[in-house]
């Protein structure tokens, strides 16, 4: 009997974000069939005429693939049998942002789920003591961000304090004319304190911590993607 007579199957996606110029993952899972021959995976993008990717009969079928995705997509072929339909997207572009559909057909039926994919640039900040400055100064640098983020300083000792008056942030366009280098300087730093440099845009939030004591300096960094139901 045809597809119309089959049941629907559950397909699950996770909203995610891609870092421009790097490889990204569009996550999609489904209850797998035991046999590979009956599994078809189609990835589609809203507003794009051709397919983003198609996998059927155990291999890629790219004859209908849209030009903008040519040579940039792959499924994890060895994991399809266990229900992983996730798509690897190489060299993420700003224009890859949008709504994607993961469409699955198995012997049991068909199902689909949408996924919101954001693109931008985000990187881990590094906080260092700026020994070139005339006073005790911290310098927070992150090489790649887009869209332009906000930068906020915080301190463990002076919780809730506003450091905007004693900090200076600049954004320098990188050579590819999209992403920017973020540099923020914090003045009048006291020792025996932990300072945090927090960089955030609508895609990611990153924090660089530095603990300054008389005997040592300790650093820690953390990056979190926003609006991703991880």
């Amino acid at each position: 009997f045809g597809i119309s007579g089959r049941h629907s199957i559950t397909v699950t996606t996770v909203a995610s974000a891609g870092n421009i110029g790097e490889d990204g993952i569009l996550s999609c899972t489904f209850e797998p069939d035991i046999k590979l021959s009956d599994i078809v995976i189609q990835w589609l993008k809203e507003g794009v005429l051709g397919l983003v990717h198609e996998f059927k009969e155990g291999k890629d079928e790219l004859s209908e693939q849209d030009e903008m995705f040519r040579g940039r997509t792959a499924v994890f072929a060895d994991q399809v049998i266990v229900g992983n339909a996730s798509l690897r997207l190489k060299n993420v572009q700003l224009t890859d942002a949008g709504t994607y559909k993961c469409y699955i057909i198995t012997s049991k039926g068909k199902g689909n789920a949408n996924l919101e994919y954001k693109t931008g640039a985000f990187s881990m900040p590094e906080v260092n003591v700026d020994y070139n400055a005339s006073s005790e100064t911290l310098r927070c640098e992150a090489p790649r961000w887009f869209p332009q983020p906000t930068v906020v300083w915080a301190s463990q000792v002076d919780q809730g304090a506003n450091f905007s008056e004693v900090s200076n942030t600049s954004f320098e366009l990188n050579s590819e004319n999209v992403t920017m280098k973020v540099v923020s300087v914090l003045y009048n730093v006291t020792i025996n304190n932990t300072y945090s440099c927090m960089i955030e845009n609508d895609i990611a939030k990153a924090t660089g911590d530095i603990k300054v004591t008389e005997s040592e300096i300790k650093r820690r960094s953390h990056l979190q993607l926003l609006n991703s139901k991880a």
Epitope: I9, E31, I34, D38, G58, Q79, I81, V82
Partner: antibody, heavy 116, light 107 residues
Framework: EVQLLESGGGLVQPGGSLRLSCAAS????????MHWVRQAPGKGLEWVAS????????YYADSVKGRFTISRDNSKNTLYLQMNSLRAEDTAVYYC?????????WGQGTTVTVSS | DIQMTQSPSSLSASVGDRVTITCRAS??????VAWYQQKPGKAPKLLIY???IRESGVPSRFSGSGSGTDFTLTISSLQPEDFATYYC?????????FGQGTKLEIK
């Protein structure tokens, strides 16, 4: 440690029934499909039946269709094989195996002997 | 049904030898082929999946290749613990089918 442990094998007369169990531990059982595979004495491996993670897909070898039933209880992390109308040619070591790309985890096997 | 024809059915070799076992599917199974090692009285052990991906913990002397209908398992330098029976299996379509096995014996 990821483990599968079969039980329920034994000696049974032709036409009789047995229920094999496979207890899983060390992994999220409800996320994986499972297989039963058997091996007759001195012979090769023969696939018997498969069941997907949520029991949505069930398949049988022609040689056991209508006589064997594969099932699972995800709350108990256990796979079952109900074997009815047993024949002499069903005599074998029965293995349960986890479904992945191939069968990546196997139990130690349980012996079923069908004889009068 | 897809038949998996394995050859040779038995093979004598010495420690240090390079050994090749082949498996031919009666129709295309893409790359949905696995290889197993089985020792007497023991359960099979997965060596290779997706035709060429080595399972975690499997020594690098084991390698797999092929796509479509023709597949190969190669052991680059036989070790004493490698003497066993080897099976190929397709998981492209049901019924899932195994090759008849290749018994690798000490020469």
């Amino acid at each position: 440690e990821v483990q599968l442990l079969e039980s329920g094998g034994g000696l049974v007369q032709p036409g009789g029934s047995l229920r094999l169990s496979c207890a899983a531990s060390g992994f999220t059982f409800s996320s994986y499909g499972m297989h039963w595979v058997r091996q007759a004495p001195g012979k090769g491996l023969e696939w018997v039946a498969s069941i997907s993670s949520s029991s949505g897909y069930i398949y049988y070898a022609d040689s056991v269709k209508g006589r064997f039933t594969i099932s699972r209880d995800n709350s108990k992390n256990t796979l079952y094989l109900q074997m009815n109308s047993l024949r002499a040619e069903d005599t074998a070591v029965y293995y349960c195996a986890r479904a992945s790309s191939g069968m990546d985890v196997w139990g130690q096997g349980t012996t079923v002997t069908v004889s009068s | 049904d897809i038949q998996m024809t394995q050859s040779p059915s038995s093979l004598s070799a010495s420690v240090g030898d390079r050994v090749t076992i082949t498996c031919r599917a009666s129709q295309s199974v893409s790359s949905a082929v696995a290889w197993y090692q089985q020792k007497p009285g023991k359960a099979p052990k997965l060596l290779i999946y997706a035709a060429s991906i080595r399972e975690s913990g499997v020594p690098s002397r084991f390698s797999g290749s092929g796509s479509g209908t023709d597949f190969t398992l190669t052991i680059s330098s036989l070790q004493p613990e490698d003497f066993a029976t080897y099976y190929c299996q397709q998981y492209y379509s049901t019924p899932l089918t195994f090759g008849q096995g290749t018994k690798l014996e000490i020469k």
